[in-house]
């Protein structure tokens, strides 16, 4: 089974090396999740041609997947540590329902999908410890998430393949933006 960062023997500090700082641990954790996403994307792209043709096959995408915007304070121009951290945590919490959706979407990478989901939960906990303004973080409504999950799972095979591709692509972009922002904190 895939191991989370910190469980791997290579992560155990050598006698004279410095233990990982909180920021380094978060950085490593995000890179671990990104590796998992790459593996899942590989399976998705091998299974269908969604990866090449998704743009021209869709008129509209109403999935409301979290996305970084200028106002979120995570970009170099207008960078704001507190606002950005709230956006990252809120975005990850919003992605959780989509990561739950991914759980039964993979054959050969089933464990990898579970690892991405679990390590995202751990990442949220790491970041919540770092955040000063926890009151500003809105948690998605469980009932809304449940009905969204039902709706996504009721789609036909083609739409489910497309949904899977879009979730993985958006999650990758969100994590890459988060990683860049967190390195400035």
């Amino acid at each position: 089974a895939p191991v989370l960062p910190g469980e791997d023997s290579k992560d155990v500090a050598a006698p004279h090396s410095q233990p990982l700082t909180s920021s380094e641990r978060i950085d490593k954790h995000i890179r671990y999740i990104l590796d998992g996403i790459s593996a899942l994307r590989k399976e998705t792209c091998n299974r269908s041609n969604m990866c090449e043709s998704s743009k021209e096959a869709l008129a509209e995408n109403n999935l409301n997947l979290p996305k970084m915007a200028e106002k979120d304070g995570c970009f170099q121009s207008g960078f704001n540590e507190d606002t950005c951290l709230v956006k990252i945590i809120t975005g990850l919490l919003e992605f959780e329902v989509y990561l739950e959706y991914l759980q039964n979407r993979f054959e050969s990478s089933e464990e990898q999908a579970r690892a991405v989901q679990m390590s995202t939960k751990v990442l949220i906990q790491f970041l919540q410890k770092k955040a000063k303004n926890l009151d500003a973080i809105t948690t998605p409504e469980p009932t809304t998430n449940a009905s969204l999950l039902t709706k996504l799972q009721a789609q036909n095979q083609w739409l489910q393949d497309m949904t899977t591709h879009l979730i993985l692509r958006s999650f990758k972009e969100f994590l890459q933006s988060s990683l860049r922002a967190l390195r400035q904190m």
């Epitope: 043709s53 021209e56 096959a57 869709l58 008129a59 509209e60 995408n61 109403n62 999935l63 409301n64 709706k151 996504l152 009721a154 789609q155 036909n156 083609w158 739409l159 497309m162 949904t163 879009l166």
Partner: nanobody, 124 residues
Framework: DVQLVESGGGVVQPGGSLRLSCAAS????????MAWFRQAPGKEREFVAV????????YYADSVKGRFTISRDNAKNTVYLQMNSLRPEDTALYYC?????????????????WGQGTLVTVSS
């Protein structure tokens, strides 16, 4: 399930107009994105136009932009395709399709429900 029945096809001269209708029955019509596709003999089924759930947004294939207009009347559970400036290459069997999904596709595999089709022939 959703049942779709198209009507309004026929023979028309180049430059003429036709209005296709698609009547839906079954589930809550306003939840569905509704589309028109067409299939000419020996060719693949191709996207023509789609209208979003509430009817706020419409999308068209480049080949029909400016000539065809898709609209819907949720009170009547009907979607329309107004076709103007018809050309011989518009000759095809026109199908109505529906889907309830956050994704609105331009690919036929993105739709769950289909009508039987109505034939449009553009000829002088």
């Amino acid at each position: 399930d959703v049942q779709l029945v198209e009507s309004g096809g026929g023979v028309v001269q180049p430059g003429g107009s036709l209005r296709l209708s698609c009547a839906a029955s079954g589930r809550t019509f306003s939840n569905y994105a509704m589309a028109w596709f067409r299939q000419a003999p020996g060719k693949e089924r191709e996207f023509v136009a789609v209208i979003s759930y509430a009817g706020g947004r419409t999308y068209y294939a480049d080949s029909v932009k400016g000539r065809f207009t898709i609209s819907r009347d949720n009170a009547k559970n009907t979607v329309y395709l107004q076709m103007n400036s018809l050309r011989p290459e518009d000759t095809a069997l026109y199908y109505c399709a529906a889907v309830d999904s956050p994704l609105i596709a331009t690919h036929p595999r993105g739709y769950d429900y289909w009508g039987q089709g109505t034939l449009v022939t553009v000829s002088s």
